[in-house]
């Protein structure tokens, strides 16, 4: 029943070209190259892609032609290593080219940069974009793939093809509309926000595979798919997990052609077998390939089967618990996770994994005890505090969010996290805390039964952003500890951190708090980021500042910006009033 058992192909590149078709082949090779060589100009990448495509066509015509039997890693790596400016642009990454496969590909993967030094993407005027789209649609869309891929080196490649399809559809429709901007801009905003979320979700999957191994990813997948497909049997879920793990391992490993091909096969299998998987797949399965795969990945949870028996019979009361555990540990734990998850769509995946870990630890201890059953009889009682901790945390934070609104809730989190890990760079603290704060508007609107899976699994994605950014430039032992000790306990680890008493406050620098008239022309979002950056810096200067002190300073700051943006001579106002504000703030905080 393995979806991916294939006959051996003489030429892997010809096989993938035929499976995927020329358009998808070229798009995926462009994504792969842009994710590896993130600084290379667009034109250079297009040239490389065209060369690879022409070569693939010769292999399609004759699979026995010279070099057609080489692996994709060898072919693509050789092509990347022809880039003339490799050492000047990428430094030590050029040393990868001296290695043989598979070490060379591993080397390229290690040099992927989650925070590349690239200019922010600025959106041109709508008319300019529409002209560019009409002038050369193919180049316009390739440029989109290139710009997203190089900024998000772990973006899920087959899903990026889906985004590009929507991007094209938006321009096709809106560039003909009476009011182009009103039609196009909301669509582009939606794609941008969804794209960032998709990138972050995939980054967690890759981190899970790369830092914690296949077993960790499979456990996550068993829990999530069991919640989503509670009517499917364990054997079916296990099969889907095996196939999904292969797909994500390939994409996270840079094997984008194989990944896209296998994802298409998996979608086909799911749709052919939907009767034994889920009743919610019908609409998804009627869509074209890219939409189908996306739809399946986002499909709502199926209804739980009626009359599911108590878990205790098999996992606590049975005489065979230790026998089952000893003879097939991972199958037994997988079944536990499956049975628990399909009964609890109201739990986060990370909570389900904590419960499974607790169950595993208990069996490890108890199955070696004199009376195993007596020892593990109360194991389900140990779950209660683990379930209550996220429930209480979400309740408290949703109350705070409802009281403050998103911006002020983000500010509360900025203060909280800056006090926990003040060594982390200010841009990272602002970005991560803003995203953490979005959990309020994303999840607090949901009923109780949907809040935890929404909130805690979203927080896992955001905290992974902190972990990957921090890994690039480690500055805090506490962050390293929370990020590396346990994937499923990252959020509780960060939640448990108190104020870092070892932190030596930053020297006060008036320049940090000097503002200019350009702030007046910024969008509301950018203005918020400026204010939040100042707030983080304040806390770094005065970590013991109270909420009241910080609120007073921030209120003064908001009033100062509002006043000077209304002034005739804005720049003079910012200079003079700014000095007064800095002095007043220093006094208020006792700096």
């Amino acid at each position: 029943r393995g979806v991916f058992r294939r006959d051996a192909h003489k030429s892997e590149v010809a096989h993938r070209f035929k499976d995927l078709g020329e358009e998808n082949f070229k798009a995926l090779v462009l994504i792969a190259f842009a994710q590896y060589l993130q600084q290379c100009p667009f034109e250079d990448h297009v040239k490389l892609v065209n060369e690879v495509t022409e070569f693939a066509k010769t292999c399609v015509a004759d699979e026995s032609a010279e070099n057609c039997d080489k692996s994709l890693h060898t072919l693509f790596g050789d092509k990347l290593c022809t880039v003339a400016t490799l050492r000047e642009t990428y430094g030590e990454m050029a040393d990868c080219c001296a290695k043989q496969e598979p070490e060379r590909n591993e080397c390229f993967l290690q040099h992927k940069d989650d925070n590349p030094n690239l200019p922010r993407l600025v959106r041109p005027e709508v008319d300019v974009m529409c002209t560019a789209f009409h002038d050369n649609e193919e180049t316009f869309l390739k440029k989109y793939l290139y710009e997203i891929a190089r900024r998000h080196p772990y973006f899920y490649a087959p899903e990026l093809l889906f985004f590009a399809k929507r991007y094209k559809a938006a321009f096709t429709e809106c560039c003909q509309a009476a009011d182009k901007a009103a039609c196009l801009l909301p669509k582009l905003d939606e794609l941008r926000d969804e794209g960032k979320a998709s990138s972050a979700k995939q980054r967690l999957k890759c981190a899970s595979l790369q830092k914690f191994g296949e077993r960790a990813f499979k456990a996550w997948a068993v829990a999530r798919l069991s919640q989503r497909f509670p009517k499917a049997e364990f054997a079916e879920v296990s099969k889907l997990v095996t196939d999904l793990t292969k797909v994500h391992t390939e994409c996270c490993h840079g094997d984008l052609l194989e990944c896209a091909d296998d994802r298409a096969d998996l979608a086909k299998y799911i749709c052919e077998n939907q009767d034994s998987i889920s009743s919610k797949l019908k609409e998804c399965c009627e869509k074209p390939l890219l939409e189908k795969s996306h739809c399946i990945a986002e499909v709502e949870n199926d209804e739980m089967p009626a009359d599911l028996p108590s878990l205790a019979a098999d996992f606590v009361e049975s005489k065979d618990v230790c026998k089952n555990y000893a003879e097939a540990k991972d199958v037994f734990l997988g079944m536990f996770l499956y049975e628990y998850a399909r009964r609890h769509p109201d739990y986060s995946v990370v909570l389900l994994l904590r419960l499974a870990k607790t169950y595993e630890t208990t069996l490890e201890k108890c199955c070696a005890a004199a009376d195993p059953h007596e020892c593990y009889a109360k194991v389900f009682d140990e779950f209660k505090p683990l379930v209550e901790e996220p429930q209480n945390l979400i309740k408290q934070n949703c109350e705070l969010f409802e009281q403050l609104g998103e911006y002020k809730f983000q500010n509360a989190l900025l203060v909280r996290y800056t006090k926990k890990v003040p060594q982390v760079s200010t841009p990272t603290l602002v970005e991560v805390s803003r995203n953490l704060g979005k959990v309020g508007s994303k999840c607090c609107k949901h009923p109780e039964a949907k809040r935890m899976p929404c909130a805690e699994d979203y927080l896992s994605v955001v905290l992974n952003q902190l972990c990957v950014l921090h890994e690039k430039t480690p500055v805090s032992d506490r962050v390293t500890k929370c990020c590396t000790e346990s994937l499923v306990n990252r959020r509780p680890c960060f939640s448990a951190l108190e104020v870092d008493e070892t932190y030596v406050p930053k020297e006060f620098n008036a320049e940090t708090f000097t503002f200019h008239a350009d702030i007046c022309t910024l969008s509301e979002k950018e203005r918020q980021i400026k204010k939040q950056t100042a707030l983080v810096e304040l806390v770094k200067h005065k970590p013991k500042a109270t909420k009241e002190q910080l609120k007073a300073v921030m209120d003064d700051f908001a009033a100062f910006v509002e006043k000077c943006c209304k002034a005739d001579d804005k720049e003079t106002c910012f200079a003079e009033e700014g000095k007064k504000l800095v002095a007043a703030s220093q006094a208020a905080l006792g700096l």
Partner: nanobody, 126 residues
């Protein structure tokens, strides 16, 4: 849906042997936890032996350990119970039961098995 059909019961002397068969249709028996239960007149249905699906772990009631052997032939989609050294107290109607989706766990609790055969009578008497 799973249909189960037992055969092989009959009258046997104490110390004798019998081999029960359970033919399954509608599902492959190798991916399903299957078990034999028995019910003597006036008594509760009790677990005799079980085998996991996919992972061939076997389970026995203490009263039959060493005397009975459960096995299956996946090519024939059939479950067997080889019963040796039979005793009068083994007299009962023997039922085959299946728990689809359970590749490993064979519970000893009868009401957790959704699929049952109609039973085959085993009488041990001299």
């Amino acid at each position: 849906e799973v249909q189960l059909l037992e055969s092989g019961g009959g009258l046997v002397q104490p110390g004798g042997s019998l081999r029960l068969s359970c033919a399954a249709s509608g599902r492959y028996i190798d991916s399903t936890a299957v078990a034999w239960f028995r019910q003597a007149p006036g008594k509760e249905r009790e677990f005799v032996a079980g085998i996991g699906g996919g992972v061939d772990i076997t389970y026995y009631a203490d009263s039959v350990k060493g005397r009975f052997t459960i096995s299956r032939d996946n090519s024939k989609n059939t479950l067997y119970l080889q019963m040796n050294s039979l005793r009068p107290e083994d007299t009962a109607v023997y039922y085959c039961a299946a728990r689809p989706g359970r590749p490993l766990i064979t519970s000893r609790v009868a009401n957790l098995y959704p699929y049952w055969g109609q039973g085959t009578l085993v009488t041990v008497s001299s």
